[in-house]
């Protein structure tokens, strides 16, 4: 699709080509199942270009198709200790907010191995909040390059 | 300047218990995983538990799981072992390690260590 | 778990000489993710290498790590009176993080 040379002085942002790409802040504390996200050109290669974080929760501002993607790495693993836990490690991205959108967009397990990534193309509307969710005990890496999060909007 | 200073070490008889502590200075504290690592005489190094930062999740050796407790206190910026059914094998100098910023356990910083010795 | 076997178990030399160190693991390490620590008689270990090859903060280059998979090699290229010690290489790809027993390099 080629742009007018009027779309071509725009910024990005007013054509609705949102795009974040955030890494690993911290994890929650107990009972809080949620990985916490930061973004930034002084943290490295993460950027926000349109969404918003929300206490480290990946909030969306523009309606439209986004593809969602998402690797993560445990620093503290071992491939029996991801197969033998009572709860098994699993990694769960979703809609968490508003509370009448909430849904489950991408669901992995770690079975026999320390790196999952997966990736989807979803709608997604102004004000959903994504988060991401690492059930069981073990510990993702916050290397920039085993652990990333972000969203690319697609079309309307 | 990063610095760890461990304490409650001592002596105690088999089955008993004791609780050390950490004290944590020079860094942002609950932004990093930390661990304890354990030396007994003339052994070698022996990891025994880990906490992520925010204290949400923890990490036990087999020889001591179920027996010893990793907690820490962001706001004291301490970190806690505690340990209940000691063993003569526990006997050890107790090393506070902080994780690297990646969370991998490898060991950037480690307190001087406090002793504890177990036996009748 | 991974063991980790580390050879010699002591290592005579004089100043200036090079010393080797290896430490070879049981099974492949995950990401060469090894580190090698410097203890001296009645400290704590500390951190040398980390990644089988990246220099910790304030680490002089006579230290470098190498190898990867199962066998890792310390080299310190001349020998500074203050390098003789105990050094220990650990692992930290898998869980349980597990640590050699030690090569001690003591003067000749």
């Known amino acids: 699709q080629r742009l007018s040379r009027a779309q071509q002085q725009l910024p990005l942002e007013s054509l609705g080509w949102d795009i974040a790409e955030l890494q690993l802040n911290h994890t929650g504390p107990q009972q809080d199942p949620r990985l916490y996200w930061q973004g930034g050109p002084a943290l490295g290669r993460s950027f926000l270009r349109g969404p918003e974080l929300d206490k480290g929760q990946l909030r969306i501002r523009r309606d439209g198709i986004y593809m969602v993607h998402i690797q993560v790495t445990l620093a503290i693993c071992s491939s029996t200790s991801t197969s033998r836990h009572h709860h098994p490690t699993t990694l769960a991205v979703g809609i968490c907010s508003p509370a009448s959108r909430s849904i489950s967009l991408l669901r992995l397990s770690f079975h026999q191995g320390c790196t999952i990534a997966s990736q989807r193309l979803t709608p997604l509307a102004r004000g959903d909040t994504l988060c991401t969710n690492l059930t069981g005990t073990l510990l993702p890496s916050r290397n920039t390059d085993e652990t990333f999060f972000g969203v690319q909007w697609v079309r309307p | 300047e990063v610095q760890l200073l461990e304490s409650g070490g001592g002596m105690v008889q088999p089955g008993g218990s004791l609780r050390l502590s950490c004290a944590a200075s020079?860094?942002?504290?609950?932004?990093?995983?930390m661990s304890w690592v354990r030396q007994a005489p003339g052994k070698c190094l022996e990891w025994v538990s880990a906490?992520?930062?925010?204290?949400?999740?923890?990490f036990y050796a087999e020889s001591v799981e179920g027996r010893f407790t990793i907690s820490r206190d962001n706001s004291k910026n301490t970190l806690y072992l505690q340990m209940n059914s000691l063993r003569a094998e526990d006997t050890a100098v107790y090393y506070c390690?902080?994780?690297?910023?990646?969370?991998?356990?490898?060991?950037?910083?480690w307190g001087q260590g406090t002793l504890v010795t177990v036996s009748s | 778990e991974i063991v980790l076997t580390q050879s010699p178990g002591t290592l005579s030399l004089s100043p200036g000489e090079r010393a080797t160190l290896s430490c070879r693991a049981s099974q492949g390490v995950r990401s060469d993710y090894l580190a090698w620590y410097q203890q001296k008689p009645g400290q704590a270990p500390r951190l040398l290498i980390y990644?089988?090859?990246s220099r910790a903060t304030g680490i002089p280059d006579r230290f470098s790590g190498s190898g990867s998979g199962t066998d890792f090699t310390l080299t310190i290229s001349r020998l500074e009176p203050e390098d003789f010690a105990v050094y220990h290489c650990q692992q930290y790809g898998s869980t349980p993080p597990t640590f050699g027993c030690g090569t001690k390099v003591e003067i000749k």
């Open positions: 990644g089988a090859s």
């Open positions: 020079g860094f942002t504290f609950s932004s990093y995983a």
């Open positions: 390690t902080k994780h690297d910023y990646s969370n991998y356990p490898y060991f950037d910083y």
């Open positions: 906490i992520s930062g925010s204290g949400g999740r923890t």
